[in-house]
């Protein structure tokens, strides 16, 4: 019968008694940087080409015996998970292995760098189809390793890495912390984060998604037809490398940004029990478990968006945090969040010719996060329109005045320390969808975009008094591009997008008493691409 | 994911205006930085990745590596160039004493230097 992990990543329409998704990733080459591998294992024979690359440190300990099957264990299993004949994700993918980990599973940053350089040189000498690089390893944060990953990603290579098995913030490890790399955490058959002894899967904003990573059946180097069950974020990353190979084989022209957005879009949402994560990491950690798309033909017509959290700003009075989108993505909105509620909002600003999302801490605040909504919007022309504080009682307003431009997001930023001490504005009048409204003492920023067939609408959900959180979701066929709160009182901790839902968090003041003036509204901006949607319906 | 400011140790060593009367003095006011792994047991002191500025050519990387070796030798230190990087990042991998870091950070074209560290199968 089909192993649990393959069943979990397979959409229901492909589930039979056997895992048989269409196309096995045959147009894609997957590079594996790991231990040595048993290349003639029945699961992977003829599928893996062992390169002559080897850069490993000597094994620790004077009495260490190099037992071949132990030396090959990790890499053989992962090669089997990616492309194994019986238990692999992408059975048609061909692989190339580089040895960067020794018989104890240990390597160096420098050895990994030289391995990545070897891949780049191979790519230049003999350009092939799409390349996926699997890095089932982790070390401490390394600027140079992250930089090398960035360069390789910008050369069109998809890098997939393990989040790490340290039950810690993945941002403290490399290559997991490299923004260009697809970083994968591990979940088990119960969709719980994987516990590994006293530790477990890493988490946090540097994780892109999770994948099966406990009791994963794969090729064992004990014998050529043996199987073994292994666990870890390496196994999870191998699943995503396999899924990426399948997606790229179906759509070889996909960019890294498009692939990442699709991986997120087709993931199972909100199935992970977040209670396992430290409380301060829950909001930052994506609740996504990787899955294959329901069809090999892409969903190019869809408007894909993802949420990118910044690093924490730190607590100083003028501290700011910046969230950035990938080079191929458009920043369609910007919001901010602070656990203490002390913040001075956020703004979209140009940095190096690209829009970024900057959040501002307030005096006495413990720090803020900036939250960018990053979307794939081909042929988009986006700009930010700003209105300075109105000072008048009606609040500050700004709208998209250019012909054909639609509102995709609203941000507000204020210099006063606490908007809550000032009379909040009235809510935005109805029937003006292309307008952002905010506190009279705040400057308001509207993200206005022109793109073929782009249409957007505003959805609101308000409750009379803050009760922890208010949400509003975009309906089927629409994608959340903007998420903000009305009004910007001190009760509001911030707003952020979770998949297609806008979440506004506020302090629960039900115990301290509240007035109707303190109503909180979650404002979602939902968009879709009209002409692409129509084109897809005609195809169906 | 992580931006420039990760949770890792950074030593910023100011560049002096002249070093051994170099012909190629570094650009005025720039500061090369030194990085090492925040997790002490994972550090591999004695091996360093010297990363050069983005547009540095292979020949300049090789020249910078040779210059480091020559200057180290004048101070009585042995160094070994283990690898010259090109294709992804310009730079080189060097086995040397940590005493030479200050000297290395003052070399022309140097962007930053990172001490080697361990990575592990996950």
């Amino acid at each position: 019968s089909i192993p649990w992990n393959l069943e979990r990543i397979t959409p229901p329409r492909y589930r039979a008694d056997e895992y048989q998704p269409p196309d096995g990733g045959s147009l894609v080459e997957v590079y594996l940087l790991d231990t040595s591998i048993q290349s003639d294992h029945r699961e992977i024979e003829g599928r893996v080409m062992v390169t002559d690359f080897e850069n490993v440190p000597e094994e620790d300990g004077t009495r260490f015996h190099r037992q071949a099957s132990k030396c090959d264990s990790h890499g053989t299993h992962l090669a089997g998970v990616v492309s194994g004949r019986d238990a692999g994700v992408a059975k048609g993918a061909s692989m190339r292995s580089l040895r960067v980990l020794n018989c104890q599973g240990k390597g160096t940053v420098s050895g990994t760098l030289i391995g990545l350089e070897f891949i780049r040189k191979s790519q230049l000498v003999q350009p092939v189809g799409p390349l996926v690089v699997l890095l089932p390893l982790a070390g401490g944060y390394s600027r140079v390793l992250n930089a090398a990953c960035q360069r390789l990603a910008r050369a069109g290579v998809v890098l997939v890495t393990a989040a790490g098995n340290f039950r810690d913030d993945a941002c403290l490890y490399s290559p997991a912390s490299a923004p260009e790399v697809i970083t994968v955490g591990a979940t088990n058959a119960q969709d719980q984060p994987v516990t590994l002894g006293t530790l477990g899967t890493n988490f946090g904003r540097c994780v892109d998604l999770f994948a099966p990573g406990e009791d994963i059946i794969g090729a064992s180097s004990d014998c050529s037809t043996c199987f073994v069950s292994q666990s870890g974020t390496s196994q999870a990353a191998a699943h995503v490398a396999g899924i990426a190979a399948m997606m790229l084989s179906a759509e070889p022209e996909l960019t890294l940004a498009e692939l990442r957005q699709r991986l997120i879009h087709f993931s199972a949402k909100d199935v992970i029990n977040e209670a396992w994560f430290p409380e301060d990491q829950r909001v930052l950690t994506p609740n996504l478990v990787a899955a294959l798309p329901p069809s090999t033909h892409g969903a190019g017509w869809q408007l894909f968006c993802r949420t990118v959290w910044s690093a924490h700003s730190g607590p100083t009075r003028m501290a700011t945090a910046i969230a950035r989108c990938a080079p191929d993505e458009e920043l369609l909105s910007c919001s901010s969040f602070s656990r203490s509620g002390k913040r001075r909002g956020e703004r979209m600003e140009a940095q190096g010719g690209k829009l970024v999302c900057r959040a501002h801490n307030a005096f006495g605040g413990e720090g803020v996060y900036a939250i960018a909504r990053c979307c794939l919007l081909p042929q988009a022309n986006c700009s930010v329109h700003t209105a300075p504080p109105a000072e008048a009682s009606m609040g500050t307003r700004v709208h998209c005045h250019q012909q054909g431009h639609v509102l995709t997001g609203c941000s507000s930023h204020w210099e006063v320390e606490d908007l809550g001490t000032h009379k909040p504005p009235v809510l935005r009048p109805r029937g003006q969808p292309n307008q952002c409204v905010g506190h009279r003492e705040a400057s308001i920023h509207a993200s206005c975009c022109h793109a073929p067939g782009l249409e957007c609408k505003v959805k609101e959900h308000g409750i009379p008094a803050p009760q922890g959180q208010v949400t509003v979701a975009c309906e089927e066929g629409w994608t959340l591009t903007g998420c903000s709160a009305l009004p910007g009182t001190s009760h509001v901790l911030g707003a952020y997008a979770v998949d297609n839902t806008c979440v506004v968090r506020s302090r629960d003041v039900s115990t301290t008493g509240s007035t109707s003036e303190e109503a909180v509204t979650a404002v979602a901006i939902c968009c879709r691409s009209r002409h692409l949607a129509q084109a897809s319906q005609e195809l169906q | 994911q992580e931006d420039e400011d990760g949770d890792y140790e950074e030593l910023v060593l100011a560049l002096r205006s002249e070093e051994d009367g170099l012909a190629e003095a570094p650009e005025h006011g720039t500061t090369a930085t030194f990085h090492r792994c925040a997790k002490d047991p994972w550090r591999l002191p004695g091996t360093y990745v010297v990363v050069l500025k983005e547009e540095t050519h292979l020949s300049q990387s090789e020249r910078t590596a040779r210059r480091l070796q020559a200057q180290a030798a004048r101070r009585g230190y042995l160094t070994k160039i283990l690898h010259v990087f090109h294709g992804l990042l310009p730079g080189f991998l060097v086995k040397m004493s940590g005493d030479l870091l200050e000297l290395a950070l003052k070399l022309p074209h140097v962007d930053y230097i990172e001490e080697d560290s361990s990575v592990f199968a996950q």
Epitope: S39, D40, G46, M49, V50, C223, T225 | -
Partner: antibody
Framework: QVQLVQSGAEVKKPGASVKVSCKAS????????ISWVRQAPGQGLEWMGW????????NYAQKVQGRVTMTTDTSTSTAYMELRSLRSDDTAVYYC????????WGQGTLVTVSS | QPVLTQPLFASASLGASVTLTCTLS???????VDWYQQRPGKGPRFVMR????????SKGEGIPDRFSVLGSGLNRYLTIKNIQEEDESDYHC?????????????FGGGTKLTVL
């Protein structure tokens, strides 16, 4: 192109041993193991076992276990199959085939066991 | 372990089509089966692998497009269209079973195809 070239025909007496060689070319030898299959006159195919060209691990069919030894020499990309204590019912054409996939086969070596 | 059953003989006229069957024993419906062609006096030649979803991987070297496979339940079929004289051969099917020390390869008895 991929080729498996086997040694020539052998005539052996019962109780003797035979060693058949199989020289591989046209691919990376250590990326595929070698399977050995035999075919008695007028009969179907019978699997004898497999050897890893990577680490020398073997997997033998129960019927020949204890009498068969499979080895490889990676320096010459050659696999060997030795069968001991030959009996008349070991008379067959012996084939080597590439890996578990068995996608390429040698031309066969006829071993005749006769007193 | 599975048992593979093949009819001893099959025949077809030149230019016609023929379907050869290899049947797995009960309980092995998910198994992949390999088809081999063996011309008189020659060694076996890999044709292709088949499971219930059809071909697995790619055809053997030099196998013409006239050869195709299908799988349904316990049956694995090899169909040859527009039969030529050079297709007159024995056709064997084989399957892998088990893992570790229990691993075996089993073959069917073979089907002798005659071109009329």
């Amino acid at each position: 192109q991929v080729q498996l070239v086997q040694s020539g025909a052998e005539v052996k007496k019962p109780g003797a041993s035979v060693k058949v060689s199989c020289k591989a070319s046209g691919y990376t030898f250590t990326s595929y193991g070698i399977s050995w299959v035999r075919q008695a006159p007028g009969q179907g195919l019978e699997w004898m076992g497999w050897i890893s060209t990577y680490n020398g691990n073997t997997n033998y069919a129960q019927k020949v276990q204890g009498r068969v030894t499979m080895t490889t020499d990676t320096s010459t990309s050659t696999a060997y199959m030795e069968l001991r204590s030959l009996r008349s019912d070991d008379t067959a054409v012996y084939y080597c085939a590439r890996g578990y996939t068995r996608d390429y086969w040698g031309q066969g070596t006829l071993v005749t066991v006769s007193s | 372990q599975p048992v593979l059953t093949q009819p001893l003989f099959a025949s077809a006229s030149l230019g016609a089509s023929v379907t050869l069957t290899c049947t797995l024993s009960s309980g092995y419906s998910s198994y992949e089966v390999d088809w081999y062609q063996q011309r008189p006096g020659k060694g076996p030649r890999f044709v292709m692998r088949v499971d219930t979803g059809g071909i697995v991987g790619s055809k053997g070297e030099g196998i013409p497009d006239r050869f195709s496979v299908l799988g349904s339940g316990l049956n694995r079929y090899l169909t040859i269209k527009n039969i030529q004289e050079e297709d007159e051969s024995d056709y064997h099917c084989g399957a892998d079973h088990g893992s570790g020390t229990n691993f075996v390869v089993v073959f069917g008895g073979g089907t002798k195809l005659t071109v009329l």
